[in-house]
């Protein structure tokens, strides 16, 4: 599931983590492309313990991921739902 | 404006349930990333994480007390509630509830209630 | 279960003076930690986030770092209105940990 939202006029990311997050634990996931004074992309994760936390965006297996779960919600419903923030 | 007030008995005796209600307002657990804590302050000392409560009632405890606590929420009320079974002397503190929202920046208990003063006394 | 051990337990210091307090975690916590400042008679408030991140309407002599698994708190020139108890928190995995806190007196 795609949607569309505005973002905030900053960077939310502070620092990104770079272990691998599995599918299985991941609720959902919010990909910001720059724009609206952030001038990189940023990649939110929450998971099923209840931390949400920056990753990086260029790192293998997030593209990886990504691509599984799009593919996922063309075909049944997504594992986890993918929210995609589009700057103004 | 996020608000926090916690309520319930200032004394108790020993081996009696502590029953404590936190009701807030400004932000609802309903919405998706919300939780609600629980924390400890016995007087003079530091502070003791008790439990959290989150929107989709997924609950966390600390495991030295897990089989005393029990953590609950009524979502329409904007209450949070915490139970202690079987009270004795070492819970007399100040207890607070706090809120938790999953954003980015993270930064649980962002707001706090003024605390209410629980004493277990025979 | 995390331990952060905090130091030192208090501290006494002149208006003015550059004081740091620090919390040790006995496993990673990455950077996430909190520091609460609790001014007496009232309810924790986070002063520092994700460890060197300042808190909305905290002054800029506040200041959080981090050199391995010390974590550290400095007010760069203390006033009169810094004097409080600080506790850091681990926010890494769940049980949350606390520090067992520093008070902060002024001289």
């Known amino acids: 599931i795609l949607e569309a939202h505005y973002t905030n006029l900053k960077c939310r990311c502070s620092g990104v983590i770079s272990t691998v997050v599995g599918l299985n634990i991941i609720d959902r996931i919010q990909v910001t492309p720059p724009g609206n004074g952030c001038p990189k992309t940023e990649v939110v994760i929450w998971t099923k313990m209840k931390k949400v936390i920056c990753v990086n965006p260029r790192a293998k297996w997030l593209q990886r991921l990504l691509r599984h779960v799009q593919s996922k919600s063309l075909s049944s419903t997504p594992q986890a739902p993918v929210s995609k923030r589009r700057a103004a | 404006q996020v608000t926090l007030k916690e309520s319930g008995p200032g004394i108790l005796q020993p081996s009696q349930t502590l029953s404590l209600t936190c009701t807030f307002s400004?932000?609802?657990?309903?919405?998706?990333?919300?939780?609600v804590g629980w924390i400890r302050q016995p007087s003079g000392k530091g502070l003791e994480w008790l439990a959290n409560i989150w929107w989709d009632d997924d609950k966390y405890y600390n495991p030295s007390l897990i089989n005393r606590l029990t953590i609950s929420k009524n979502t329409s009320n904007n209450q949070a509630f915490l139970k202690i079974t079987n009270v004795d002397a070492p819970d007399t503190a100040t207890y607070y509830c706090?809120?938790?929202?999953?954003?980015?920046?993270?930064?649980?208990?962002?707001?706090w209630g003024q605390g209410i003063m629980v004493t277990v006394s025979s | 279960d995390i331990q952060m051990t905090q130091s030192p337990s208090s501290l006494s210091a002149s208006l003015g003076d550059r004081i740091t307090m620090t919390c040790q975690a006995s496993?990673?916590?990455?950077?996430?930690l909190i520091w609460f400042q609790q001014k007496p008679g009232k309810s924790p408030w986070p002063v520092i986030y994700?460890?060197?991140n300042l808190a909305s309407g905290v002054p800029s002599r506040f200041s959080g770092s981090r050199s391995g698994s010390h974590y550290s708190l400095t007010i760069s020139s203390l006033e009169s209105e810094d004097m409080a108890d600080y506790h850091c928190?681990?926010?890494?995995?769940?049980?949350?940990?606390f520090g067992s806190g520093t008070k902060l007196e002024i001289k």
């Open positions: 706090a809120r938790s929202e999953l954003v980015m920046p993270y930064v649980p208990f962002d707001f």
């Open positions: 496993q990673d916590i990455g950077i996430e």
């Open positions: 994700y460890t060197a």
């Open positions: 400004g932000f609802s657990l309903s919405t998706y990333g919300m939780g």
């Open positions: 928190l681990q926010y890494k995995q769940y049980p949350f940990t």
